[in-house]
Amino acid sequence: VPDKTVRWCAVSEHEATKCQSFRDHMKSVIPSDGPSVACVKKASYLDCIRAIAANEADAVTLDAGLVYDAYLAPNNLKPVVAEFYGSKEDPQTFYYAVAVVKKDSGFQMNQLRGKKSCHTGLGRSAGWNIPIGLLYCDLPEPRKPLEKAVANFFSGSCAPCADGTDFPQLCQLCPGCGCSTLNQYFGYSGAFKCLKDGAGDVAFVKHSTIFENLANKADRDQYELLCLDNTRKPVDEYKDCHLAQVPSHTVVARSMGGKEDLIWELLNQAQEHFGKDKSKEFQLFSSPHGKDLLFKDSAHGFLKVPPRMDAKMYLGYEYVTAIRNLREGTCPEAPTDECKPVKWCALSHHERLKCDEWSVNSVGKIECVSAETTEDCIAKIMNGEADAMSLDGGFVYIAGKCGLVPVLAENYNKSDNCEDTPEAGYFAIAVVKKSASDLTWDNLKGKKSCHTAVGRTAGWNIPMGLLYNKINHCRFDEFFSEGCAPGSKKDSSLCKLCMGSGLNLCEPNNKEGYYGYTGAFRCLVEKGDVAFVKHQTVPQNTGGKNPDPWAKNLNEKDYELLCLDGTRKPVEEYANCHLARAPNHAVVTRKDKEACVHKILRQQQHLFGSNVTDCSGNFCLFRSETKDLLFRDDTVCLAKLHDRNTYEKYLGEEYVKAVGNLRKCSTSSLLEACTFRRP
């Protein structure tokens, strides 16, 4: 019988008392065979973390800094439930650490050396740990003691709680460095006042500070935020211009066997019965015998952290970088103006082989990192384990939602200035066998479908988006009798037609033979009624152009396109018979890597791009025998995006809206995780 007890860790006598009351009150609001509470008392949060890791307790609520400690080996804990603040309609689970400056001051993030700084307090998250952690490698050596390095970096500071005797420069702007509100420049409002009064040039606070201190928009307009990419933005654009996004207060549990479903069931039922304004007898978010016992008194409720989210993703790349810099104190040897090798993310075995060949030929400019699915690759780019990959538009959308940016676009048409002219896109089409003459766009119900993969543009987002508008529900597996849509749930009818063996069946990578454009077309040839692919797929795999046994005798004339008006047309008439225009595949990366990825890829395509005439004896970046490994095989070049440098601008309003509509049908655990961080 699974143990349905959640052992809550308390760190004081008062917390233990509240925990016992929590335990007793939960008994009547949960079924007798449901989760129950037990209380475990420890001396500190770090002891609680160790106890959970050792399976002596199951859950505790932590601030962001401790979530980082809990995640580190050997603890390996993960966030499972987040407290939220504000309203249920607009729940806030994160705050943003920002650098505020006066509008006319004219310097950027990389020009802070020699400026005067205002901090909320020494060792505090938004006011010290995050900004100093991110600036760590710019601090003058020796970087220990840290206070001395910071004092030598800025020309003067107010860092309340610092030792004014040992580090007088840190108290230059607020004599004495008092560690309470008696110091007018202490805390969030104090640090902002330090900037406002003209004592400092920059204040490190949280995003809400400026709104709490300046009710008038005209006053707020006198200030700006410094962004990590060395630009500035208005103060209300903090979601796109911050130093880090920080979770407020989070319940953690073991990564393996952590009872997260049980913890959620318990806390969700608890907030239902004992949350804000629910009950007089016991209140979850109230601490009569102290402050913030078990949970923050200011919390309004709980949200389940998506299961795909580990601590690194939850805390975010910037926060983890800042805290790791402070804790580990290591900085790269290389001068910062030189690009490090780009770590390319390769999907499964076939892509890894090609990537390794690229790496050798690039003489150290490219390194390879492997993952089993596109989403795993995106996650690795997010957390810094990888740097870049080329993605179908559907995944550019997910990557964009996860904070990545497009940097170059694949171009498929030969032109004189290929690299300077990103194309409008390719066509998403529905292909059928000519012999199935009664089949039209209007009678696909009950037919067998072939898709490149779930979440991809031509194979899924466009056709299923159109279908959703028609049927108004997400049960596509009931609409088609069976199909192959790699990435579907294994027991779904949309995995039934797939050909992968064992664990590879229906996997969204090349181990599944019906994956991708060529795979979906092969599925049509061998088993299906309709394939959703790009307009070039049929010509690329017929007339002897694909030498594989299944394709070598195929004839383009044996296939037709389904038009949205219910008619059919020959394959070459795709311009007048398609489902929609699809954005070209694009290379994505993190914002901090954008310039280097751009620079190195442009060098690489000049060496190994379409200008290489003999691919039998030389490495060709855009060739892989119709398998579309790393890049589409019909790529002519990688083109500059000019001003289309965000996922929304790159994909276009229409496509973003179409994918947004399909979101309610999404099975993407990564998209769910990323929209949790940024709804």
């Epitope: 079924p31 007798s32 449901g34 049980l262 969700n268």
Partner: nanobody
Framework: DVQLVESGGGSVQAGGSLRLSCRAS????????MGWFRQAPGKEREGVAV????????YYADSVKGRFTISEDNAKNTVYLQMDSLKLEDTAMYYC?????????????????????WGQGTQVTVSS
Amino acid sequence: DVQLVESGGGSVQAGGSLRLSCRASGHAYSGNYMGWFRQAPGKEREGVAVLYTGGGSTYYADSVKGRFTISEDNAKNTVYLQMDSLKLEDTAMYYCALVLGSARWYTSSLDARAYNIWGQGTQVTVSS
């Protein structure tokens, strides 16, 4: 108005399998106890399998443990009951039910009295 729509019932040989579906419409799906109950002719309604929607625990009657699996699809607001190794005694009308609002529990998750929203039912017949 909350509605539960069941489907997937039918006749099957002993040892065979069936998959029942129950779709909830008209309410916030996550964070409720929802599951399957059955009633054979002349017998009381009994709990079969329940889950806490939106990623919570699962609960099974002893008589079906290891043979039946309850699961959910959040995107479709749907709960499934996969019934394998069916026996003659599994023959019954199967009902989907949901706890909406804050119920008070004095007994187990499989106690039908706590559930306030019910579907019309779907017949499952197992023959030898």
